[in-house]
């Protein structure tokens, strides 16, 4: 396989992943290969290594299809576990309510000496990056509970007590923002490293797939909306009625303060909180129990709705108005979002046409805001901030390119709630 | 490739009418904002008119110079652009030009037609 | 209406040179400024807009510098093509208007 380098790129049957990505290659015949791991190195080359999987110290060890090593029946998922909590399923496999496990290709800024774990809690999986302890053996082992491998005799290590902190921001700061890629991935059949990073995410229109850094953090969500029961959530042995919000206590994260989770009827929905880039006060301050830095002293006054204070500023970002004109005609769809900004003081145009769900013309224009004034049929929908339009753009970059070649019928809309900036649970920025 | 062909130029009587035409190739027409600019002989240019796209409503706006006198229009199934002229006076003597605009409403003029003369004058 | 005014009105210089053509607004249209070439008997053709971004197909020795209300278009080493007459145009609001126009013509 020819790899071509260029910029912070490898190239690998005809598909680009940034350094230090990992996947499994997709071989012909056999498809995915699970048992052999990819990695795209500094210099550009793909290194490939065969996975090498430990003793297991049972009698009949069990092959799962998804999953190169064999387990022991013990380190399997409970099948007698109680009804009442849900069950979660990620890339065809299904997960029990407390399970925790390994995830591939999430992060696109992972470190070396990281690897994902996921959740499974109450329907939804939850992953995030865990920086694993320095091995100091030649031949380390997978443990049931830790995505890490751990020297033999350290198999009692649990992930709190690796060096690292799950939630640190790895020191690659090029992919802060990403209105997450894989949303929009083809489908894994024949596709290189064909991990569909978030498999059926465009049937769960609630799936969140942000990993902008938020006070160090970087959280993984996948929210399953199938089940549905009562007119309340249920969320780690809690009951949460209708419009209420609360910060998911994880088994293996414990309280996460940069995801908020809202009661919507019968499902919970969860975001990750968006810390601002600058903040009005020159020394922001963290706080135990909050996600993001605070100003001392300081506290915005919520408006119906959003929380923005006088100035406009949204947790201590500023926040710019957001307009949107949608024109339907003969089966065509075009819908411009704009942004109007102060410095320099414009309006950014971005025109989508959208025709049977594939995308026939996308560009970007920048006009004065006195040329935008001319244009009646623009109407005020939400305010949002400098960094929540970084994500916006980035993910349309991507969608645009997708878009153009497969049919897409929730992609742009999805991508526009990226704007809406939600009201903040009291005192959380 | 990208062109824009005017015709329906030539001689008219002051407070005559005329009506020129425009006829757009190798892009997609319905998007764009289309503009006439012309120029007198030996003069530098001067914008006349703008239609902007069916999904802009069609929004028209003219120089003062040519307010109530003449008319932007356009068929988009067909890539034309019009200019119906009347109560022409003698100042209106000039090249036409059918203009596109970079885009649905940015103002600059990125394709430019090879023009049509009209000549008013009794 | 804003006012755009150039100058000078006809510059005389040689094939290699460089020069210099200025366009003045009578208020601030910040970057939304295009430049146009029109040689004799032609249509004219986009060079420059946004002030400084140049059009598909233009060789890299025009380059369009200001903001504001003060703007110049640079040329460097002058081809015998580059000969001929050179408008500003504000792209601000509407009406957009150009300058007078500049003469560009062979010493």
């Known amino acids: 396989e020819q790899v071509k380098h260029s910029e912070t790129y490898c190239m690998f049957q005809d598909k680009k992943y940034r350094v230090g990505e990992r996947w499994h290659p997709y071989l012909e015949p056999y498809g995915l290969v699970y048992c052999v791991n990819c990695i795209c190195s500094e210099n550009g080359n793909v290194l490939c290594s065969r996975v090498r999987c430990p003793n297991v110290h049972c009698l009949s060890p069990v092959h799962i299809p998804h999953l190169c090593c064999p387990r022991c029946p013990d380190s399997l998922p409970p099948v007698n576990n109680k009804v009442t909590s849900k069950s979660c399923e990620y890339n065809g496999t299904t997960y029990q309510h407390g399970e925790l496990f390994v995830a591939e290709g999430l992060f696109q800024n992972r470190q070396p000496n990281q690897c994902t774990q996921c959740s499974c809690s109450e329907g939804n999986v939850y992953c995030g990056l865990k920086t694993c302890p320095k091995l100091t053996c030649a031949f380390p082992v997978s443990v049931p509970d830790s995505c890490c491998r751990v020297c033999r005799g350290d198999g009692e290590l649990s992930w709190e007590h690796s060096d690292g902190d799950i939630f640190r921001q790895p020191a690659n700061r090029e992919a802060r923002h990403s209105y997450h890629r894989s949303h929009y991935d083809p489908p894994p059949s024949r596709q290189a490293g064909g991990l569909s990073r978030f498999p059926g995410a465009r049937s769960h229109r609630g799936a969140l797939m942000d990993s902008q850094q938020a006070s160090g953090t970087i959280v993984q969500i996948v929210i399953n909306n199938k089940h549905k029961h009562g007119q309340v959530c249920v969320s780690n042995g809690k009951t949460y009625s209708h419009g209420e919000s609360w910060h998911p206590n994880l088994r293996a994260f414990g309280i996460v303060e940069c995801v908020l989770c809202t009661c919507n009827v019968t499902k919970q929905e969860c975001k990750k909180i968006h810390c601002p880039n600058r903040y009005p006060c020159k020394y922001p301050q963290k706080i135990d129990g909050k996600c993001c830095k605070v100003c001392p002293g300081k506290k915005a006054k919520e408006l119906p709705g959003q929380s923005f204070d006088n100035k406009g500023y949204f947790c201590g970002e500023e926040t710019m108005p957001v307009y949107e004109s949608v024109f339907m005609e003969d089966g065509e769809t075009t819908r411009k979002i704009a942004l109007e900004t102060e410095r320099p003081p414009q309006v950014e145009v971005h025109v989508w046409t959208i025709r049977k769900g594939i995308l026939q013309h996308f560009h970007i224009e920048k006009i004065s805001k006195r040329m935008f004034e001319e244009l009646p049929h623009f109407k005020l929908v939400t305010r949002t901030t400098l960094s929540q339009w970084k994500i916006f753009t980035e993910g349309e970059a991507q969608i645009s390119q997708m878009c153009s070649s497969r049919v897409c019928r929730t992609e742009l809309e999805d991508l526009v709630k990226v704007l809406y900036l939600e009201r903040s649970e009291k005192g959380h920025c | 490739e990208v062109q824009l062909v005017e015709s329906g130029g030539g001689l008219v009587q002051p407070k005559g009418s005329l009506k020129l035409s425009c006829v757009a190739s190798?892009?997609?027409?319905?998007?764009?904002?289309m503009h006439w600019v012309r120029q007198a002989p030996g003069k530098g240019l001067e914008w006349v008119a703008r239609?902007?796209?069916?999904?802009?409503?069609?929004?028209?706006y003219y120089a003062d110079s040519v307010k109530d006198r003449f008319t932007i229009s356009r068929d988009d199934s067909q890539s034309m652009l019009y200019l119906q002229m009347n109560n022409l006076k003698t100042e209106d003597t000039a090249m036409y030009y059918c203009v596109r605009d970079g885009g649905y409403y940015v103002g600059y003029f990125d394709v430019w037609g090879t023009g049509t003369t009209v000549t008013v004058s009794s | 209406d804003i006012q755009m005014t150039q100058s000078p009105a006809t510059l005389s210089a040689s094939v290699g040179e460089t020069v210099t053509i200025t366009c003045r607004a009578s208020?601030?249209?910040?970057?939304?400024l295009a430049w146009y070439q029109q040689k004799q008997g032609k249509s004219p053709h986009l060079l420059v807009y946004?002030?400084?971004t140049l059009a598909e197909g233009v060789p890299s020795r025009f380059s369009g510098i200001g903001s504001g209300t003060q703007f110049s278009l640079k040329i460097n080493s002058l081809q015998p093509e580059d000969f001929g007459s050179y408008y500003c145009q504000h792209h601000y609001d509407t009406p957009p208007t150009f300058g007078g126009g500049t003469n560009l013509e062979i010493k």
């Open positions: 239609i902007r796209s069916k999904s802009s409503n069609y929004a028209t």
């Open positions: 190798g892009f997609t027409f319905k998007t764009y904002a």
């Open positions: 208020e601030n249209i910040y970057s939304y």
């Open positions: 946004n002030a400084k």
